[in-house]
């Protein structure tokens, strides 16, 4: 029995080839311990700027100074490392810019050597120049989500430097990753800063974190591995997307849904609506409206853009993706604020992906 009543039906049309995506790395700012760091929020025309670190609101304190579009950290320590965001709240919309702060003795990543999959060359490191760990080749680490067919070999790399030479260890889902945790174990090639798992199976799915540390600091990086069984599979949606958003009346907002599907996916953006003053049909099922779907006349179905929003646009937006095998859907909420209230990026909480079995 259908779980909803469609207010606006759509027919399936030929769509664009499936998108295989990767998650990009935010810009990285490096500071040495004890130094001051100043970052300018790279957003234009900001009326109000709010800051977060690792998703938590950042306010001024004795070491953190927030002046206009600038964030200053005085006497930086490794604890200041993390993912920062500045949200510019304008009269009509809001925009968020993300960046990483890495408090380390490392020189800028522009001085990294080119990695040719061989051992990183640390011989030139001056033994007197003590350094906390730092990434030497962030390009090798940009692809965070790896969707790999079963039976393939997976290699995760975290090329790093430091003095003394850092050590590397690996966690799976936040816990120590032991050889006995998988049949056939795994290989760690310290000179390549890599973890290698051969012949992956579905139980290898999860988050893999490299922790690189020495006595001066610790850095880490997480990869997500999805093992695609060697049989047709349902669409996979990137966790955390679409993300909750807020804007003021008259503002614009975008929801993004990232899809991985070998089979041609059909993407629909759906919203709960009212019909004749009711949210539910005579059968007790909610009324849903298809706002956008992939097809010949639809550009970039992974993005739903709403312009000049009104209070009526507030609510839950569902990204529903189907292929001939099955479906997956995730949703996000739009909060529409009165014009005088400046919005901030909400904590990104989404419905659990339904593709997990």
């Amino acid at each position: 029995r259908p779980s909803f009543s469609l207010v606006e039906d759509t027919t399936l049309e030929p769509e664009e080839p499936p998108t295989k995506y990767q998650i990009s790395q935010p810009e990285v700012y490096v500071a040495a311990p004890g130094e001051s760091l100043e970052v300018r929020c790279l957003l234009k025309d900001a009326a109000v700027i709010s800051w977060t670190k690792d998703g938590v609101h950042l306010g001024p304190n004795n070491r953190t100074v927030l002046i206009g579009e600038y964030l200053q950290i005085k006497g930086a320590t490794p604890r200041d490392s993390g993912l920062y965001a500045c949200t510019a709240s304008r009269t009509v919309d809001s925009e968020t810019w993300y960046f990483m702060v890495n408090v380390t003795d490392a020189i800028s990543s522009g001085d990294d050597e080119d990695d040719t999959d061989g051992a990183e060359d640390f011989v030139s490191e001056n033994s007197n120049n003590k350094r906390a760990p730092y990434w030497t080749n962030t390009e090798k680490m940009e692809k965070r989500l790896h969707a790999v067919p079963a039976a393939n070999t997976v290699k995760f790399r975290c090329p790093a430097g430091g003095n003394p030479m850092p050590t590397m260890r690996w966690l799976k889902n936040g816990k120590e990753f032991k050889q006995e945790h998988r049949i056939g174990g795994y290989k760690v090639r310290n000179q390549h800063w890599s973890l290698i798992m051969e012949s992956v199976v579905p139980s290898d799915k999860g988050n893999y974190t490299c922790v690189v540390e020495n006595e001066y600091g610790s850095i880490n990086h997480t990869y997500h591995l999805d093992v695609v069984e060697r049989s047709p599979h349902r669409p996979i949606l990137q966790a955390g997307l679409p993300a909750n958003a807020s804007t003021v009346v008259g503002g614009d907002v975008e929801f993004v849904c990232k899809v991985y599907s070998d089979a041609q996916p059909h993407i629909q953006w759906i919203k709960h609506v009212e019909k004749n003053g009711s949210k539910y049909g005579p059968d007790g099922l909610p009324y849903l409206k298809v706002l956008k779907h992939s097809g010949i006349n639809s550009s970039n179905a992974e993005v739903l853009a709403l312009f000049n929003v009104t209070e009526a646009d507030a609510g839950e937006y569902i990204c529903k993706v189907s292929n001939y095998i099955g479906q997956a859907n995730q949703s996000a909420w739009l909060t529409v604020l009165p014009k005088q209230q400046a919005p901030g990026r909400e904590k990104e909480i989404t419905a659990s992906p339904d593709y997990l079995e």
Epitope: L12, P17, P232, A263
Partner: antibody, heavy 114, light 107 residues
Framework: QIQLQQSGAELVKPGASVKMSCKAS????????MHWVKRTPGQGLEWIGL????????SYNQKFKGKATLTADTSSSTAYMQLSSLTSEDSAVYYC???????WGQGTSLTVSS | DIQMTQSPSSMSASLGDRITITCQAT??????LNWYQQKPGKPPSFLIY???ELAEGVPSRFSGSGSGSDYSLTISNLESEDFADYYC?????????FGAGTKLELK
């Protein structure tokens, strides 16, 4: 192992309706589409439609709209197809197949005859 | 609807032969194509998916190739159990559509 067990052969009169079943085991029934396919000597294989058991979403081949009705019961991991207003043209073997059309039921033979 | 033109409709071959069956779609189907084998009184059996991927348990003498709108199934070194009907299926767009089938007979 994955199995799709279909109901037995049917002999029905023209104008009647029939409801056949397909019981799934060995996988998470609700998270895979269930397809239905018709096989006749003259027409070969024809896709009738699909149902997504988790929410009851259906998609039909226009040719079979009004002829076939697909339903699913997640509590028993069983999919159903009802065929109405039967004629001799509906005599065929009907298969259910899991989402990727990778696993198929053994087929239900339908004969429409007076 | 996407039409799938399968050829030949029937063919004869000997044990040990190498044969090729083709399917042409009326538009680009981006490798969204499966191949099936069917024997009398049995349901179709899954051979190849996404045009080139061999399904679990299928002998390596079966292979799929193609892209765009043109696809083929090749069986090298034919064995006695390979004589059957073969169908292609496109799943790029609903309604899903099958080729008309190829009957492979022993010469």
């Amino acid at each position: 192992q994955i199995q799709l067990q279909q109901s037995g052969a049917e002999l029905v009169k023209p104008g009647a309706s029939v409801k056949m079943s397909c019981k799934a085991s060995g996988y998470t029934f609700r998270y895979y589409n269930m397809h239905w396919v018709k096989r006749t000597p003259g027409q070969g294989l024809e896709w009738i439609g699909l149902i997504y058991p988790d929410n009851g979403d259906t998609s039909y081949n226009q040719k079979f709209k009004g002829k076939a009705t697909l339903t699913a019961d997640t509590s028993s991991s069983t999919a159903y197809m009802q065929l109405s207003s039967l004629t001799s043209e509906d005599s065929a073997v009907y298969y259910c197949a899991r989402g990727g059309l990778d696993y198929w039921g053994q087929g239900t033979s339908l004969t429409v005859s007076s | 609807d996407i039409q799938m033109t399968q050829s030949p409709s029937s063919m004869s071959a000997s044990l040990g032969d190498r044969i090729t069956i083709t399917c042409q779609a009326t538009q680009d189907i981006v490798k969204n194509l499966n191949w099936y084998q069917q024997k009398p009184g049995k349901p179709p059996s899954f051979l190849i998916y996404y045009a080139t991927e061999l399904a679990e348990g299928v002998p390596s003498r079966f292979s799929g190739s193609g892209s765009g709108s043109d696809y083929s199934l090749t069986i090298s070194n034919l064995e006695s159990e390979d004589f059957a009907d073969y169908y292609c299926l496109q799943f790029y767009e609903f309604p899903l559509t099958f080729g008309a089938g190829t009957k492979l007979e022993l010469k």
